[in-house]
């Protein structure tokens, strides 16, 4: 039903979902924290234009006893609940923030007439992709795919010089929500990835993933993964591996990796990590003191999401335009506003737009370098180094399948 | 419009130092490498190393790694090349020139002519 | 290091010709480079990965080729393109140049 929003008269209502089921385990506390940080920072925006109007926002706490997993993959009617309990006490905002569970929002976007913005830090899934009142501030999987595409099939880099079109994808179902999701998009038969690659086999079991570092016979030399280091070292040990397989770790809200005193350890070398540039000014910020490195992106997007509200509301009163019409709801992608650590960019459909960076692990100094750093916002690849130090022959990047002889002619434009 | 803007021609003696630089607009110096390469009289064209100005990695072709020294100054949007103990081999015109991968050194300063002579 | 051999290093010819230049690596690359220089001046991106014509270049030229040899043709010369063109290649780590073409007027 229609929920009249509290939306008018210089007071600006954000309704931000507190849900038991969350893309991080992050405390309520923090999230709150980061949303009033944001606050302040809009309200000072306002002011400085000359908006003399109210922001505030409402936390929406859901039912701890019915939703306590704190799993997104429990998490499908959790949101249509919360909904419901707005629409009960008539307490509509301008906008909603949260859920970030693709399961939950995609439930919500199905279910619901959505005349008013949705801010997700989440909804990593493909079935998130595309929604028209939807903005996503955390890398969707579509961003991560079309990187991958990307880099298997460039072969005109010096380190880089045979397009691959195989691969092994890594899955075992105990993954976090954006690792699930990254890899659920890499598995579907229908997706983009799929679509470009010749072969690619999910494997499931930890000893299906050791038997293939080793095996003569395997079908690529290029194992997806997705999680940090460590998760990494659980699997593979300290056992062997030929000298032709890259595994890519996929760990994209993981600051560590840049962090001075870093030393890679011996099972990163034949691994390349993709992660996201980092923020400069996040490490000292009153709301990201207590937060480690991996749980800061998911406080910041929260914090961003109330930004870029402020910046919506900013332009509409600016232009005299009202605030509660699909104009408004629809309006949320296409731009760059001023987020919490600088610019932040939207593509045509509400997604984030960012640096990813490819790092590989220096065999003369046992640091992670950067290799090349990919702009989601054009699909364009930025060389960094262009003779890394790497552990494999010659200083390149293998061939995806052994003993197929050169490739060279394989020209993607 | 992109522009790579180098520092005039100098004049050395055998042992001494030059800093070339190479000064950038029209475009985000940070986010493309920046390359040199050498030109001696009558000889081809020699690529001596490249730097990534948002990172700092350098790469340098070994028969130059001696010799040359890439730095940048990112406030300035300028990269230099120094050149050390300098020999009659090393009279040439030295360009910086920009990649815009996949098309490499897409753009090339005006060249700085170094000549060194005793 | 790759070594590039251009063919021929000097080329006499009247506007209007075809000419084809030529560019043959010591072991086999991707892709190959251009790039036009004319006396007192800095070279030009003209050609990028064998057969992409860098932004302002004439549809005259073309370029093509793979492993180890590879081919710059301009179908009809005019009076600007007298100039002397280079090869380079980026496949390994350093990237080398051809020694140039001098194509002169006849």
């Known amino acids: 039903s229609q929920v009249s929003q509290n939306c008018h008269n210089g007071s600006y209502e954000i309704s931000v979902l507190m849900m038991g089921n969350s893309a991080f385990a992050e405390p309520l506390k923090n999230l709150e924290d980061a949303v009033n940080e944001g606050l302040e920072i809009v309200r000072g925006r306002l002011q400085n234009a000359g908006l003399n109007v109210t922001v505030n926002a409402t936390f929406m706490y859901s039912d701890g006893l019915i939703h306590n997993s704190g799993d997104c993959r429990s998490s499908t009617c959790e949101g249509l609940d919360l909904l419901r309990k707005i629409s009960n006490a008539q307490r509509m905002g301008c906008v909603l923030i949260g859920p970030s569970c693709t399961y939950s929002t995609f439930q919500m976007y199905l279910d619901t007439e959505l005349s008013y913005p949705m801010i997700s830090a989440g909804s990593f899934g493909l079935s998130c992709d595309y929604k028209e009142t939807l903005t996503r501030l955390m890398s969707p999987a579509r961003k991560l795919m079309y990187f991958l595409v990307n880099f298997w099939k460039t072969n005109d880099l010096p380190f880089k010089t045979y397009s691959w079109s195989t691969s092994y994808v890594y899955k075992n179902g105990t993954e976090t929500e954006d690792c699930f999701w990254y890899l659920n998009a890499l598995e579907a038969s229908v997706s983009y990835f799929s679509h470009e690659l010749g072969f690619k086999v999910v494997l499931r079991q930890d000893k299906e993933f050791q038997d293939i570092l080793m095996d003569h016979n395997r079908k690529s030399n290029v194992i997806i993964m997705c999680g940090g280091p460590e998760f990494l070292y659980k699997l593979k040990g300290d056992r062997a591996v030929a000298e032709d397989i890259v595994i890519i770790l996929v760990d994209l809200f993981n600051d560590q990796y840049f962090e001075d005193n870093v030393t890679a350890p011996d099972y990163m070398k034949n691994v390349l990590v993709l992660t996201l540039s980092p923020g400069n000014s996040l490490l000292n910020s009153s709301f990201s003191r207590n937060l480690s490195p991996t749980k800061r992106d998911f406080a910041l997007a929260y914090l961003n999401g109330i930004l870029l509200f402020g910046h919506m509301l900013k332009i509409f009163l600016e232009n005299g335009e009202n605030i509660t019409t699909p104009k408004f709801a629809h309006a949320f992608r296409n731009l760059t506003f001023e987020g919490y650590d600088g610019p932040v960019t939207l593509d045509d459909w509400g997604d984030v737009d960012s640096t990813m960076v490819l790092l590989y692990t220096s065999v003369d100094t046992k640091k992670y370098k950067v290799l090349l750093t990919y702009d989601t916002h054009v699909n364009k690849t930025y060389p960094v180094d262009m003779s890394p130090t790497f552990t494999w022959k010659n200083s390149k990047l293998p061939n995806d399948i052994t003993g197929r002889g050169p490739q060279h002619h394989h020209h993607h434009h | 419009e992109v522009q790579l803007v180098q520092s005039g021609a100098e004049v050395k003696k055998p042992g001494a130092s030059v800093k070339v630089s190479c000064k950038a607009s029209g475009y985000t110096f940070t986010d493309h490498n920046m390359n040199w390469v050498k030109q001696a009289p009558g000889q081809r064209l020699e690529w001596m190393g490249v730097?990534?100005?948002?990172?700092?990695?350098?790469n340098y072709n070994q028969k130059f790694k001696d010799k040359a020294t890439i730095t940048r100054d990112t406030s300035a949007s300028t990269a230099y090349m120094e050149l050390s103990s300098l020999r009659s081999e090393d009279t040439a015109v030295y360009y910086c020139?920009?990649?815009?991968?996949?098309?490499?050194?897409?753009?090339w300063g005006q060249g700085t002519t170094v000549t060194v002579s005793s | 290091d790759i070594q590039l051999t251009q063919s021929p290093s000097f080329l006499s010819a009247s506007p209007g010709d075809r000419v084809t230049i030529t560019c043959s690596a010591s072991?086999?690359?991707?892709?190959m480079y251009w790039y036009q220089q004319k006396p007192g001046s800095s070279p030009k991106s003209w050609i990028y990965?064998?057969?992409n014509d860098a932004s302002g270049v004439p549809s005259r030229f073309s370029g093509s080729g793979s492993g180890t040899e590879y081919t710059l043709t301009i179908s009809s010369l005019q009076p600007e393109d007298f100039a002397t063109y280079y090869c380079?290649?980026?496949?390994?780590?350093?990237?080398?140049f051809g020694g140039g073409t001098k194509v002169e007027i006849k």
């Open positions: 020139a920009r990649d815009d991968y996949p098309n490499y050194f897409d753009y």
């Open positions: 990965r064998t057969s």
């Open positions: 730097m990534n100005p948002k990172f700092g990695t350098i």
């Open positions: 380079q290649q980026y496949h390994d780590y350093p990237p080398t």
């Open positions: 072991s086999s690359v991707n892709y």
